[in-house]
Each structure stands twice: as C-alpha cells, then as structure tokens.
C-alpha cells in the first residue's frame, strides 16, 4: 500500500503526473521523430515532504537521514513509478517505422 | 548502454553511490530493530547534469525540458537503479527474527 | 491485435444528442503517440474528420464541427466517446472510430455504425 | 482547410494490367523535414477502410508491395503495378500535415 497520498504543502504541490507538451525540436527529436509532431510528455514533478508517496523502505531511509543531515543527504525525489508506451514514427535506414517506447511517458509517480 | 559516466562538475559532484552511517535512533528504528545497531546506508546522491547516467528515454528527455523550462521541469534526479538486500533482528510478536529487506540499500545509481 | 468498436442507437431524433462510445480491445487506450479518433462517411460519400482525443484528455476537433462537439475518454473503462449536439438528417452518415498516430497512419478502424437522424 | 482533388472519379481496370490514381492538394504536402504528408487507404466494399501507404511512399504493414505511392509538394500519385480482383474498392488520399486532416473525394476502381 501507498504510503500516504495527502499533500501537506496544499494541492498539487507534491510529486504527481503533470502533462508537459513538447514539439520535436524541444526534445532534440526533429532530425529522427516525423509523428507525432507535438508530444504529450507526461512527468513527474512536485515535492516529496516526509513519507510522501514513499516508494520503499529506502525512501522512507533517505526521508529519516534528510531531516538529520539536510545538507548531505537530499530528500527524496519524484520520479516515475511506472511507464506507458509510446509510439514513434521515425527515421530508419531504410526508410520510416513505427516504434514503440516503453520507457518515456510517465504513468504512475512516487518518491524515492 | 547506460549514458555518459564523466562528471562534468568535477570528480565525485555527479550522481553516485555514497555510504552515510546511521544508529537505529536516526532512522526511528530503535523501538523495532535490535541488530545491527549502526547502519551503513547507501544512497544515491550528487547532480544530474546533462545526459550523466540518464536511466531511459524518460530521464533524456526530461533534461531537453528541463534546459527549456527550468521552472517547470526540474532536472532528472540521482536514484538507485538497483539495491542489495539487507538483513536486520527485528522484534516481533512473539519474539525476534531475521528480516531480509530487499528495497532498502542502494547498490547502483542513475539519474531519472 | 487492437480492435475498436463503436457502439450506440442507430437512430436520433432532430434537435436531440448523437452518443457513441469506441471500445478498445487488444490494447491499452493509455499508449502515447496514438490518437483515439471519430471519423464519419455520409451515405455514398467520401469521408470526415470529426475529432481526436489523447489518452490525457487534450483534444481536437474539426473547426466545421467543434461547436457541437465533445470527445471524452475513459481510460479504465478503455473507452472513448463521441457526443454531437443539435443534430440534423446532414449528421447521418456511418460513423466510425480509429487509432492513429497524430493525424495519421489511421491503421485500425471500427467496423462503423450508422446513424440516422430523423424523426 | 487544405482542399484534396483526386480523379479519375472511376477507374475500370483490367487484372494483371497497372493503375495510377492521382491525387492533387490545394497547398504543399511537403513539411520541412523533407517528408510528405500524405496517406493512401483502401476501403473495400462494405468494409472500413485500411491504411496503405502513409507519408506519400511508405508502404503500411502487410501491405502488397504492387502497391507503390510517389510524388511531392501538390502531386501525388498511387500506383498498382498489376491489379488482382481484391484491389476492387474506393480509394482515398488523405492530407495529414496539418489540422484536420482531409480527405479526396475517392476514386473507386472497378475490373472492367
């Protein structure tokens, strides 16, 4: 179970889903990406205050060593717990292909 | 192939493992934890600059938006990409057993 | 292999809402890239591009058509949806839903249904 | 909107014999990729209709290699290099570079 989903810094200012879009040359992608031409880039961005949506043991460590030692040792970080995928129709060789991306759009965040 | 392993910041800035010791006391693990009574935490720690140890395509990108939009995107940040078990003598109901966790020591890091 | 299938009454009444809902099998509605599409061939003619809805819920409509227009999505339902106000006999046509990559690359469709408006 | 113009309107053909269906755009399909925004698709009596060719040349997965598309800027073209009895159907170019997309009129080839 995840540990707790109320944010005490007010709503939305801790680590959640945001949808940031993108064109391709943004990313750096224009010289190999054709489609889609803008991307819905879905990351995770906001605060992650004690023992928010801690991913394991550790986040909940490095929440613990934090408090102590807050100059050596950062709070935990809100990063992608999960993926979906994405599909790319891009540059090849040999012409153009579909492909798909499993690692590139964010679908679930925590903080670790 | 995981990307660029050269800090760019200079030698031991960039994302690595660093080992910070613990008591039980620090970690709020006094009251459940008898053995081993100082703990030696690795963590993940130190800067993400462009492209260090990004994990994914998720991380590549998130450094293209963050250049762009350093106020909406924060950079990728320093996290284990994996961990080493660790065992701890904990305090149970009906006694004292051995507890293997597997989330709790970092054994590798990456930025994402 | 992702299927779509429309489904929803084959008959509305003028003035009234048209409704349909594309259900999405063999694939999750959550891939990024793919746009969850409505498109429309009247009787005997060629084909309309109504609108399109990422998986996030951004959408984009046909500006001919917009103002009557809403296309939703549910994504643990693995469903999207068609509403179109205030319809006319002008709005029967066979309706169908697709997958496609942006604007393009529509490479699968719903078998279609057809609606007509009348009373 | 951009306007599509295809023709012939109707196409009797011949099996084993080719066929070209041209397909004109009211402005230039060419983006500054170098890429051609264009589909080609089939829709075969009582069918939906399937993707052929996208970005002018491409042929889609599982699609014939007698099927060819060609051309650049306003004018394009679709070829069948030898037509089979299951190419019957109406035929659809469809502009995709920008919104929304639009589609020809068709042209519907029948065997002779």
């Known amino acids: 179970a995840r540990n707790g989903d109320h944010c005490p810094l007010g709503p939305g200012r801790c680590c959640r889903l945001h949808t940031v879009r993108a064109s391709l040359e943004d990313l750096g992608w224009a010289d190999w990406v054709l489609s889609p031409r803008e991307v819905q880039v879905t990351m995770c961005i906001g605060a992650c205050p004690s023992q928010f949506r801690a991913a394991n043991m550790h986040a909940q460590i490095k929440t613990s060593l934090h408090r102590l030692k807050p100059d050596t040792v950062p709070a935990p970080c809100c990063v992608p717990a999960s993926y979906n995928p994405m599909v790319l129709i891009q540059k090849t060789d040999t012409g153009v292909s579909l492909q798909t991306y499993d690692d590139l759009l964010a679908k679930d965040c925590h903080c670790i | 192939a995981r990307n660029g392993d050269h800090c760019p910041l200079g030698p031991g800035r960039c994302c690595r493992l660093h080992t910070v010791r613990a008591s039980l006391e620090d970690l709020g693990w006094a009251d459940w934890v008898l053995s081993p009574r100082e703990v030696q935490v690795t963590m993940c720690i130190g800067a993400c600059p462009s492209q260090f140890r990004a994990a994914n395509m998720h991380a590549q990108i998130k450094t293209s938006l963050h250049r762009l939009k350093p106020d909406t995107v924060p950079a990728p940040c320093c996290v284990p990409a994996s961990y080493n078990p660790m065992v701890l003598i904990q305090k149970t109901d009906t006694g004292v057993s051995l507890q293997t966790y597997d989330d709790l020591l970092a054994k590798d890091c990456h930025c994402i | 292999q992702v299927q779509l299938q429309e489904s929803g009454p084959g008959l509305v009444k003028p003035s009234q809402t048209l409704s349909l809902t594309c259900t999405v099998s063999g694939g999750s509605i959550n891939s990024g890239g793919y746009y969850w599409t409505w498109i429309r061939q009247h009787p005997g003619k060629g084909l309309e591009w109504i609108g399109a809805i990422y998986y996030s819920g951004s959408t984009v409509y046909n500006p001919s058509l917009k103002s009557r227009v809403t296309i939703s999505v549910d994504t643990s339902k693995n469903q999207f949806s068609l509403k179109l106000s205030s319809v006319t006999a002008a709005d029967t046509a066979v309706y169908y839903c697709?997958?496609?990559?942006?604007?393009?690359?529509?490479?699968?469709w719903g078998q279609g249904t057809l609606v007509t408006v009348s009373s | 909107d951009i306007v599509m113009t295809q023709s012939p309107l109707s196409l009797p053909v011949t099996p084993g014999e080719p066929a070209s269906i041209s397909c004109r755009s009211s402005q230039s399909l060419l983006h500054s990729n170098g890429y051609n925004y264009l589909d080609w698709y089939l829709q075969k009596p009582g069918q939906s209709p399937q993707l052929l060719i996208y970005?002018?040349?491409n042929r889609a997965s599982g699609v014939p290699d007698r099927f060819s598309g060609s051309g650049s800027g306003t004018d394009f073209t679709l070829k069948i290099s030898r037509v089979e009895a299951e190419d019957v159907g109406v035929y659809y170019c469809?502009?995709?570079?920008?919104?929304?997309?639009?589609f020809g009129g068709g042209t519907k080839v029948e065997i002779k």
């Open positions: 469809m502009q995709t570079l920008e919104a929304p997309p639009t």
């Open positions: 970005l002018g040349s």
């Open positions: 697709a997958r496609g990559v942006e604007y393009q690359h529509f490479n699968e």
